[in-house]
């Protein structure tokens, strides 16, 4: 056994933007610190077989499987994956160890499996086995964080029951309105689960893992703001925790806060108060209303009252399951070629939706903005004046919603023509859909004014390219028009376009485009 080399197997995770298949090399990329895969001798195996710890990789991630061999003399090697041999180029590091690497870029299902590395040194032969699998992200979840009161402490714990374990952070802001946007200098982030400083203006908790980032805002009523005439609304699902913070600042401590639900005081275990003096010696009080697990009968108007400030209310609505409310009837728009235009969907939803806009099988990011009437809006302006069918899709944990839009761009027809031995066809995608005329050019009618009505077959919208209609007109050849020039014209309210076709000429058909406005 003393002849066996000392070997080390490591996994290197890369942050990369390349896409490629497995490469046997020391491929240069930005990398994380190597993870020891602890290559151990496999018992009861014929020959010397080392087995590395199983490697789980995210889809599209890039990794390097690396073996460091501490053995005298030269080594040669061969990688085998799914019965295919892959080139192997060992090199030596500064400590004179043999280094063999397999780079897997942009991990896919086809790259998962067993990677065998055969090494031959002057002293011995041995095999190293790596098992690479794609991490099952189907089991991954990212749940919106919720709040709990810390036992025996005036503090909130932020919890997100997610897989893999998320990083939880508090996002705090002490100024009003716009300056509390995520990247504003007024925003402070604290990467911890427990928060003791609960007096700030805006308090959110966010959880993030491989699936993204979800945030929950601590619903707050500020009694120092003049009450809105319309009451804010908070949706919750049965079983979720309710947290409402009522905050008031006054010149001295001579004021108190109370919570009522539908004009009845909240029960003792459903609220707790905190107070502090601010820098200018004014008193800040906050009173939390909370229910650890809401039921339908917790629905109603919650009112926070102060002995000095105008009271304020919020409507808490408890629903059995999440919803997305919006009108799903399809909408058609026609716009001019340079007209500014955005699609928009107005919806009310709980929990918050994830959404996409799709056109021509391409998905576009979807932004949503809360309106001040309880609805949200998503707009899509990046259509680049391409006519066709646009799809808005939204979903949350409990509901799905799809809405179709058709965009028509008003423009003059453009005519394309093709001909065969038996017929001539013209196509146009102008909008509004054009009407067609066919004219014969002859000695009698050098200006092509003689209209052809026989043998004409118009097809409106014979093919739909992602919602874009194309109109066509076909002229069946008859003896009367063989050998003549004919003209097909498409016209709509924006203009006319024509093509002239010489019928029955040998070889490719000459087409003469003739645009008439």
């Amino acid at each position: 056994n003393q002849d066996l080399p000392v070997i080390k197997c490591v996994l290197i995770n890369h942050k990369n933007n390349d896409s490629s298949v497995g490469k046997s090399s020391s491929y240069p990329m930005v990398s994380e610190s190597p993870e020891d895969l602890g290559c151990a001798l496999r018992p009861q195996s014929s020959g010397t077989v080392y087995e590395a710890a199983a490697v789980e990789v995210d889809v599209s991630a890039s990794i390097t499987l690396q073996v460091l061999v501490d053995a005298p003399g030269n080594i040669s090697c061969l990688w085998v994956f799914k019965h295919s041999s892959l080139n192997c180029q060992p090199h030596f590091d500064l400590q004179n160890r043999g280094v063999v690497s397999m780079v897997i870029l942009k991990m896919t299902e086809t790259q998962a499996g067993e990677y065998l590395l055969f090494i031959q040194s002057e002293a011995t032969n041995y095999t190293i086995l790596f098992t690479v699998s794609i991490r099952n992200t189907l089991l991954y979840t990212l749940r919106r964080p919720y709040f709990r009161k810390m036992e025996n402490q005036d503090a909130l714990v932020c919890i997100s029951e997610s897989v893999p374990e998320p990083i939880v952070e508090w996002v705090l802001c002490d100024s009003q309105g716009e300056s509390c946007k995520e990247e504003s200098p007024a925003v402070v982030k604290k990467e911890e689960k427990v928060l003791h400083e609960l007096f700030g203006t805006d308090i959110r908790c966010c959880a993030r893992n491989e699936l993204g980032r979800e945030c929950t805002r601590l619903f707050t009523i500020d009694l120092n703001q003049t009450p809105q005439t319309t009451l804010p609304q908070l949706f919750l699902k049965v079983g979720e925790p309710l947290w409402i913070r009522c905050k008031a600042v006054h010149v001295n401590h001579g004021f108190g806060l109370t919570w009522e639900l539908e004009n009845k005081a909240l029960e003792e275990g459903n609220y707790f108060e905190m107070s502090t003096y601010s820098t200018n010696r004014t008193m800040i009080r906050i009173l939390f209303a909370f229910v650890s697990s809401v039921a339908r009968n917790d629905t109603g108007y919650y009112t926070c009252s102060s002995s000095k400030h105008p009271s304020q209310s919020a409507l808490v609505t408890i629903v059995e399951k999440g919803f997305i409310n919006a009108t799903n009837s399809s909408e058609d728009y026609e716009i001019d070629q340079y007209e500014e235009f955005c699609f928009s969907v107005r919806f009310k939803a709980y929990p918050q939706i994830r959404c996409t806009w799709t056109f021509s099988r391409k998905s576009f990011p979807c932004e949503q903005k809360g309106l001040d009437n309880g609805y949200s809006i998503s707009k899509f302006c990046n259509h680049k004046h391409q006519p066709g069918e646009y799809i808005f899709h939204a979903e949350n944990d409990d509901a799905q919603f799809t809405k179709m839009f058709t965009l028509n761009i008003r423009r003059k027809p453009q005519v394309l023509a093709e001909a065969s031995a038996s017929q001539a066809s013209c196509f146009s995608d102008g909008y509004p859909l054009p009407s067609w005329t066919w004219k014969k050019c002859s000695d009698k009618s050098p200006n092509c004014t003689e209209e052809i009505t026989e043998g004409v077959w118009n097809r409106k919208a014979n093919r739909k390219v992602f919602g874009q209609w194309v109109s066509s007109s076909t002229l069946n050849m008859s003896e009367a028009i063989k050998g003549f020039l004919v003209k097909c014209c498409a016209y709509n309210s924006l203009g006319t376009s024509c093509e002239t076709i010489l019928l029955n000429s040998p070889g490719p058909f000459p087409f003469i485009q003739d645009n008439i406005s």
């Epitope: 108007y301 000095k308 009271s311 304020q312 309880g374």
Partner: antibody, heavy 118, light 111 residues
Framework: QVQLVQSGAEVKKPGASVKVSCKAS????????MHWVRQAPGQRLEWMGF????????KYNEKFKGRVTITRDTSASTAYMELSSLRSEDTAVYYC???????????WGQGTTVTVSS | DIVMTQSPDSLAVSLGERATINCRAS??????????VHWYQQKPGQPPKLLIY???NLESGVPDRFSGSGSGTDFTLTISSLQAEDVAVYYC?????????FGGGTKVEIK
């Protein structure tokens, strides 16, 4: 009990100003936003604006912007509404009314008649 | 501005009978889960008195023969059994949007 007592009737010439007072009692003055509403003969009630006595926030109906000013004196638990550049169509009964967010205008003053006549 | 249209302008009902007053808003007066419409009663020489708030909630101290219903743009005030003291003008009001606006009033009399 809650009471809003307004100042007496006024007769004014066109172009003049009028200031109507509304004294609150029976509750903490700063705890309720105070609104002003007027009712001209044969016309519907018309909202003029409000003041939050706690923080002195005001909001006015665009129709009266620049002509109406609502103020308050917390030590006297009194709200005031001043209307300037009076014209004959400002002849009306002017009311102060206490507003609660969950409810609406739940208590009203008795009204002050303002007559604008040359 | 949101226009509140009441109908009928006047209504004569026998004592003990039901009186129904309608109010239509020129656009929805619902926000979040609430309808921001309120009903007032005004007797001659008196200020208005709040009867119903947020479309259907009875103000404390108001007899339960008064009730309100509706959402969106259409609202109704019902007096289930008219009493002599109910003779007055009734107004609807919205505060979903500024400026707050009132209906033109419905005069209720005894037949």
């Amino acid at each position: 009990q809650v009471q809003l007592v307004q100042s007496g009737a006024e007769v004014k010439k066109p172009g003049a100003s009028v200031k109507v007072s509304c004294k609150a009692s029976g509750y903490t003055f700063t705890r309720y936003v105070m609104h002003w509403v007027r009712q001209a003969p044969g016309q519907r009630l018309e909202w003029m604006g409000f003041i939050n006595p706690y923080n002195d926030d005001t909001k006015y109906n665009e129709k009266f912007k620049g002509r109406v000013t609502i103020t308050r004196d917390t030590s006297a638990s009194t709200a005031y509404m001043e209307l300037s550049s009076l014209r004959s169509e400002d002849t009306a009964v002017y009311y102060c009314a206490r507003w609660r967010q969950l409810g609406s205008l739940d208590s009203w003053g008795q009204g002050t008649t303002v007559t604008v006549s040359s | 501005d949101i226009v509140m249209t009441q109908s009928p302008d006047s209504l004569a009902v026998s004592l003990g009978e039901r009186a129904t007053i309608n109010c239509r808003a020129s656009e929805s007066v619902d926000t979040y889960g609430s309808s921001f419409v309120h009903w007032y009663q005004q007797k001659p020489g008196q200020p208005p008195k709040l009867l119903i708030y947020l479309a259907s909630n009875l103000e404390s101290g108001v007899p339960d023969r008064f009730s309100g219903s509706g959402s969106g743009t259409d609202f109704t005030l019902t007096i289930s059994s008219l009493q002599a003291e109910d003779v007055a003008v009734y107004y609807c009001q919205q505060n979903n949007e500024e400026p707050w606006t009132f209906g033109g009033g419905t005069k209720v009399e005894i037949k």
